[in-house]
Interface confidence: low
Amino acid sequence: EGICRNRVTNNVKDVTKLVANLPKDYMITLKYVPGMDVLPSHCWISEMVVQLSDSLTDLLDKFSNISEGLSNYSIIDKLVNIVDDLVECVKENSSKDLKKSFKSPEPRLFTPEEFFRIFNRSIDAFKDFAVASETSDCVVSSTLSPEKDSRVSVTKPFMLPPVA
Amino acid sequence: EGICRNRVTNNVKDVTKLVANLPKDYMITLKYVPGMDVLPSHCWISEMVVQLSDSLTDLLDKFSNISEGLSNYSIIDKLVNIVDDLVECVKENSSKDLKKSFKSPEPRLFTPEEFFRIFNRSIDAFKDFAVASETSDCVVSSTLSPEKDSRVSVTKPFMLPPVA
């Protein structure tokens, strides 16, 4: 079973609504872990959840807390809680083949669609992650840059296939 | 009774939720009519609603249309309809003391808080506008900059002090 799998809740489904409710040209800063689009998840997941936590916490500050219904604030607040749980879980499992990327995370700007595609990819990694099978080396070409996969459909409603 | 007053509906109340649901540092372009903060409404209202219509229509394109509940798209769509109604109404009343500003509208950048404060001021103008009393000249000092009118209420339901 995937590490920390029990920490991932169905709140992630709210991401669809959140992405639709954010301006398409609004830019979200994320320290992107180089290679997460091509390397196995054990190479980047421990750093990525920390960076996602930071970015989502910062994003939360951009909204006002209104009580009625599903607001952007309430959705992001839930996502922060999910990711913070995963950060804690990763710490608990830090000896279980979760490796540090050899390159430092780089601050990049992403549209909501791009940012939450990375978010989804990270969440999916916990669902699929099996310690025993993750033994490959974490080596990535220095020419890679994030999120340039032409296979990503932008005609789908808002969500967003996992990144290649 | 104010000109076009019957075109102003309670959908405007949704602005509270909309402003809370937009990133505080997101910038919205609006061609601002110089002097609307200090001059009587007949001097600027006819131009301002046209510019608000353009800006809101542009803003609408930044969001996806999701069916469930009050989304940003659905709120902005309602506001576009309100303002477009007012544009038509202004055309019908163009002979009724509605003057053209002597200065051309200038494209400026506003946070959601600022933009919808101007929106609110414009909507209020229709509620308060009485043709007979609006006879003053439309002259504005070149040193003025917009929205410094202490008369603009920031305690109204959705409006909102200027953002940093």
Partner: antibody
Framework: LVESGGGLVQPGGSLRLSCAAS????????MSWVRQAPGKGLEWVSA????????YYADSVKGRFTISRDNSKNTLYLQMNSLRAEDTAVYYC???????????WGQGTLVTVSS | QMTQSPSSLSASVGDRVTITCRAS??????LGWYQQKPGKAPKLLIY???SLQSGVPSRFSGSGSGTDFTLTISSLQPEDFATYYC?????????FGQGTKVEIK
């Protein structure tokens, strides 16, 4: 805009800067603090909305500095705690116009952090 | 991040001077230009990339959008010798360029 409160302080110490505003409706404007280390460029430090309801900070000062305002006194404040040598700079208060970024500046007040 | 060039330049009165500012990411038109003289506070010259601030001489002009921006002084005057900063304000934290010092040749 007239700043005051600068001076020499030891590392780890505290200082409170003030900025007295006049000539405009203070509560209608967001205000910011911008600093400039000796011989260096400008660095935005913090901002506060017209009502005081929203505050913003640069990462370099987050958790150490607190911006506030008293609209009844037309005064902007910057409470600086846990000061470091790298906080040494001239601190300017600036008015943030609706469109024009920082359109009015104070003359600045020098803060020196040294043992 | 905002990168200004050149970091300094020497020019004569009457010269046409151009300073460039490049943003690491697109900032549309959310850019201002400031002038600062030694021991003085900065002064706003241009906002929204190309709008001249009230009271600023018309020899100053700004252009550009996206990532590349330019400040032009059409005919340099003695009082224009100073340091010039660009600044973006698409979102906080606002960031300034490192400055361009315009000196007398």
């Amino acid at each position: 805009l007239v700043e005051s409160g600068g001076g020499l302080v030891q590392p780890g110490g505290s200082l409170r800067l003030s900025c007295a505003a006049s000539g405009f409706t203070f509560s209608s404007y967001a205000m910011s603090w911008v600093r400039q280390a000796p011989g260096k460029g400008l660095e935005w430090v913090s901002a506060i909305s017209g009502s005081g309801g929203s505050t913003y900070y640069a990462d370099s000062v987050k958790g150490r500095f607190t911006i506030s305002r008293d609209n009844s006194k037309n005064t902007l404040y910057l409470q600086m705690n846990s000061l470091r040598a790298e906080d040494t700079a001239v601190y300017y208060c600036a008015r943030r116009d609706f469109f024009a970024h920082f359109d009015v500046w104070g003359q600045g007040t020098l803060v020196t952090v040294s043992s | 991040q905002m990168t200004q060039s050149p970091s300094s330049l020497s020019a004569s009165v009457g010269d046409r001077v151009t300073i460039t500012c490049r943003a690491s990411q697109g900032i549309r038109g959310y850019l201002g230009w400031y002038q600062q003289k030694p021991g003085k506070a900065p002064k706003l010259l241009i906002y929204s990339a190309s709008s001249l601030q009230s009271g600023v001489p018309s020899r100053f002009s700004g252009s550009g959008s996206g990532t590349d921006f330019t400040l032009t002084i059409s005919s340099l005057q003695p009082e224009d010798f100073a340091t010039y900063y660009c600044a973006e304000y698409i979102r906080m934290p606002y960031t300034f360029g490192q400055g361009t010092k315009v000196e007398i040749k």
